[in-house]
Interface confidence: low
């Protein structure tokens, strides 16, 4: 399997934004790459977001996606927004080299994202 | 050495308060117990706080201590207050059975406490 590296731990900002880099060791010269972010919590795995991009171009997530990202060579800079404390969990980066063949799949070990909900600001009198 | 258990990870609240349980497997019937919290960061170990208590009585930390706690049997519920992001680190629970002899010492594997500084509230006009 293709090697995918990502940080072990990331703390979301108090605004609920977490960013991390997902880096893959490409065995071939891919032109089309698909990146998927999976969340594992209590051993349940759910897809958070996914984007397919052409090497050298921007990542395009769906308009209603909580993810944004940029790519640079074999690195993808991912940002997840709108996180709440209940979203704390292991966020796994899955990278697929879609074209040209052969197809390669790599799964990172996951980035544990910790989110703390902010205290509400006091009402202004 | 006496076994001491503590959680692997704790998130401080947005008010900078972190609580965790330190549980020890007492080989004997101790009446006097000393609990010390150590912080390890960048391989530097510093003492955060310490308290000696009689079994069945409350833990008493110094007045200016950032720690408070309660005990129940072989469990100590520790709370550390006033934490800032720079205080993120590994907090190790050290338990000593002081009396009666023999003396026992146990050191936990540490609780990684993550602290995120809150966003400042907007100025009220």
């Amino acid at each position: 399997a293709m090697h995918v590296a990502q940080p072990a731990v990331v703390l979301a900002s108090s605004r609920g934004i977490a960013s991390f880099v997902c880096e893959y060791a490409s065995p071939g010269k891919a032109t089309e790459v698909r990146v998927t972010v999976l969340r594992q919590a209590d051993s349940q795995v759910t897809e958070v977001c996914a984007a397919t991009y052409m090497m050298g171009n921007e990542l395009t997530f769906l308009d209603d996606s909580i993810c944004t990202g940029t790519s640079s060579g074999n690195q993808v800079n991912l940002t997840i927004q709108g996180l709440r404390a209940m979203d704390t969990g292991l966020y796994i980066c899955k990278v697929e080299l879609m074209y040209p063949p052969p197809y390669y799949l790599g799964i990172g070990n996951g980035t544990q994202i910790y989110v703390i909900d902010p205290e509400p600001c006091p009402d202004s009198d | 050495a006496m076994h001491v258990a503590q959680p692997a990870v704790v998130l401080a609240s947005s008010r900078g308060i972190a609580s965790f349980v330190c549980e020890y497997a007492s080989p004997g019937k101790a009446t006097e117990v000393r609990v010390t919290v150590l912080r390890q960061a960048d391989s530097q170990v510093t003492e955060v706080c310490a308290a000696t208590y009689m079994m069945g009585n409350e833990l008493t930390f110094l007045d200016d201590s950032i720690c408070t706690g309660t005990s129940s049997g072989n469990q100590v519920n520790l709370t550390i207050q006033g934490l800032r992001a720079m205080d993120t680190g590994l907090y190790i629970c050290k338990v000593e059975l002081m009396y009666p002899p023999p003396y026992y010492l146990g050191i936990g594997n540490g609780t990684q406490i993550y602290v995120i500084d809150p966003e400042p509230c907007p100025d009220s006009d």
């Epitope: 072990a8 209590d42 051993s43 349940q44 795995v45 070990n109 | 349980v21």
Partner: antibody, heavy 125, light 107 residues
Framework: QVQLQESGPGLVKPSETLSLTCTVS????????LSWIRQPPGKGLEWIGY???????NFHPSLKSRVTISKDTSKNQFSLKLSSVTAADTAVYYC???????????????????WGQGTSVTVSS | DIQMTQSPSSLSASVGDRVTITCRAS??????LAWYQQKQGKAPKLLLY???NLQDGVPSRFSGSGSGTDYTLTISSLQPEDFATYFC?????????FGQGTKLEIK
């Protein structure tokens, strides 16, 4: 040391509710999960569901509509309720501590690391 | 649901033999696999977790290997107390499912 003990009625009538209790010692209910598993006579193991340390539950889809798992931290007890039982629910029922083993990457691998001795339940009129 | 196919379903061997049991998942389970030993009338006992990691107190003659969908439990030199039924279990998303078991008998 870690111990789990299942208890409950050995005989339940069809259409009634099966209620089992798992009493645990040697570990904290606030740090670990607990799974229920059953084994029909002469057959393999079937995972029923779990309750996580934070109270989160998850059930086998085929049993989801009939299963409730809860815990009473003060009594160190977990309970399983299975409604509308039939002869197909005749089995030995086990509870098992559910542990996440973490590595440097913070990637959690789960296992049922300690089991109760099991309690036999027959559904018959 | 992920299906776990264990083989063989039964196996006869002698003390001192090297024995291999395999488990195949219907999809990639990323090493989220545990192996258990169950003796007649007793509860299962965890042998290995994360496919290759030996649980505390389990003899080193037990080992695990594999990745993706294919996993193996090996007993390097069978001892009399090893004759039992062995189950694999995936823990990659729920429902956690078990293999159907391999009964290891004395030849």
């Amino acid at each position: 040391q870690v111990q789990l003990q299942e208890s409950g009625p050995g005989l339940v009538k069809p259409s009634e509710t099966l209620s089992l209790t798992c009493t645990v010692s040697g570990f904290s209910l606030t740090s670990y999960g607990l799974s229920w598993i059953r084994q029909p006579p002469g057959k393999g193991l079937e995972w029923i569901g779990y309750i996580w340390y934070d109270g989160n539950t998850n059930f086998h889809p085929s049993l989801k509509s009939r299963v409730t798992i809860s815990k009473d931290t003060s009594k160190n007890q977990f309970s399983l309720k299975l409604s509308s039982v039939t002869a197909a629910d005749t089995a030995v029922y086990y509870c098992a501590k559910t542990e996440g083993h973490y590595y440097g990457s913070n990637y959690g691998y789960y296992a049922l690391d300690y089991w109760g001795q099991g309690t036999s339940v027959t559904v018959s009129s | 649901d992920i299906q776990m196919t264990q083989s063989p379903s039964s196996l006869s061997a002698s003390v001192g033999d090297r024995v291999t049991i395999t488990c195949r998942a219907s999809e990639n389970i990323y090493s989220n696999l545990a192996w258990y030993q169950q003796k007649q009338g007793k509860a299962p006992k965890l042998l290995l977790y994360a496919a290759t990691n030996l649980q505390d107190g389990v003899p080193s003659r037990f080992s695990g290997s594999g990745s993706g969908t294919d996993y193996t439990l090996t007993i390097s030199s069978l001892q009399p107390e090893d004759f039992a039924t062995y189950f694999c279990q995936h823990l990659w998303g729920t429902p956690y499912t078990f293999g159907q078991g391999t009964k290891l008998e004395i030849k």
